[in-house]
């Protein structure tokens, strides 16, 4: 354990092993679980983060109505298959050969099947609606202050280009953040809205993925913004394919 290794850390992903074995002794970090090299100047993909997590020891009117095709991640954690770029593979299977198709944020978008199930392409999640309820405060937050602070948060903590934060809605105590990013809009180097939403979700739950000891301390004009409930809806460029049985259950 050398001094050089001590100086080697990944600010954007604490679930990494880092060593100075990059070019010129540069710090190089690899994600736990997959061993894939990660770029510590930006967010790590959700797929690699989920894989790392599974490998770790177990321990009204202005508000948007989610569309009928919106998905909620009800399946919880699983150990995903990631492609060489760290994205979710379109088809995911568990150890018992049960398979299903996922979207670009890793949320199931078909019924579960067997190994014969085909998932022709990874369907992009182009619209994410983050629905928050904040804890009671003395008064409502000023909407424009709240809007500015949340946009700044996504820009400066999650490195998400401001154009992808489509809107911030507020009707006390509900806050909704809309992220939109079509395939054609996303340029090389742009943070994916799915990754930004995942980092935000983990921050809000007090499970920060960033290296620092502290978590996210979110304040609006000095007033702490504490979230007591989070729901995230995912809308895909192609609607999901579930059987009627699931839809009526």
């Amino acid at each position: 354990h050398t001094a050089a290794q001590d100086n080697c850390t990944c600010p954007t992903n604490k679930m990494t092993v880092c060593s100075p074995d990059g070019p010129g002794g540069r710090c190089q970090c690899r994600a736990l679980g997959s061993g894939m090299a990660v770029d510590c100047s930006t967010l790590t993909s959700k797929c690699l983060l989920l894989k790392a997590r599974m490998s770790a020891p177990k321990n009204a009117r202005t508000l948007v109505r989610p569309s009928e095709h919106a998905l909620v991640d009800n399946d919880g954690l699983y150990d995903p298959d990631c492609d060489p770029e760290g994205r979710f593979k379109a088809r995911q299977c568990n150890q018992t050969s049960v398979c299903w198709c996922v979207n670009s944020v890793g949320v199931r978008r078909t019924d579960k099947g067997d190994l014969s199930l085909r998932c022709d392409e990874l369907v992009r999640t182009h619209h994410i609606l983050i629905d928050l309820r904040h804890r009671p405060t003395a008064g409502a937050f000023n909407h424009s202050d709240l809007d500015a602070e949340l946009r700044r948060l996504f820009r400066e903590r999650y490195r998400l280009h401001p154009k992808f934060v489509a809107a911030v809605h507020y009707e006390q105590p509900t806050i909704q953040i809309e992220l939109r990013q079509n395939t054609s809009q996303k340029a090389a180097g742009d943070v994916d809205i799915g990754d930004a939403a995942y980092y935000f979700e983990r921050d809000i739950k007090g499970e920060s993925l960033f290296q620092g000891r502290g978590g996210l301390d979110l304040r609006v004009r000095g007033e702490p913004l504490q979230v007591e409930r989070t729901l995230i809806y995912y809308l895909d460029e192609i609607p999901p394919k579930f059987s009627m049985k699931r839809l009526t259950a």
Epitope: N7, T9, P11, T12, R157, S208, F210, G212, R213, G214
Partner: nanobody, 128 residues
Framework: QVQLLESGGGLVQPGGSLRLSCAAS????????IGWFRQAPGKEREGVSC????????YYADSVKGRFTISRDNSKNTVYLQMNSLRAEDTAVYYC?????????????????????WGKGTLVTVSS
């Protein structure tokens, strides 16, 4: 083990200059934003200046704009605060700090509650 060590403080006359240094170790320096904060006797700690990680954006409190300049030398793992035209009200203990997220969120706001790691401080006294 993250460590931040400030130096360069001292006694200076009004209108004089000082250059503070913040030497960092224990982390990949060039990935992190570094900020300077100060605390005068009997007052709350306040943000003075901050410099971002990748693109080198700089942020200053209104009270020091045009007088103080922040810079960083990634090859030396050091951030500097050049303080010119010093005034009596600049007297304080100056601390450097870094946020563990590596981003600019807490840096641009010059807010101390977002900073994870702190140095022990260096005293700057401006007096005739």
């Amino acid at each position: 083990q993250v460590q931040l060590l400030e130096s360069g403080g001292g006694l200076v006359q009004p209108g004089g200059s000082l250059r503070l240094s913040c030497a960092a170790s224990g982390f990949t320096f060039d990935y992190y934003a570094i900020g300077w904060f100060r605390q005068a006797p009997g007052k709350e700690r306040e943000g003075v200046s901050c410099i971002s990680s990748s693109h080198g954006s700089t942020y200053y409190a209104d009270s020091v704009k045009g007088r103080f300049t922040i810079s960083r030398d990634n090859s030396k793992n050091t951030v500097y605060l050049q303080m010119n035209s010093l005034r009596a009200e600049d007297t304080a203990v100056y601390y450097c700090a870094t946020a563990g997220d590596g981003g600019d969120y807490h840096c641009s706001g010059l807010v101390d509650y977002g900073m994870d790691y702190w140095g022990k401080g260096t005293l700057v006294t401006v007096s005739s």
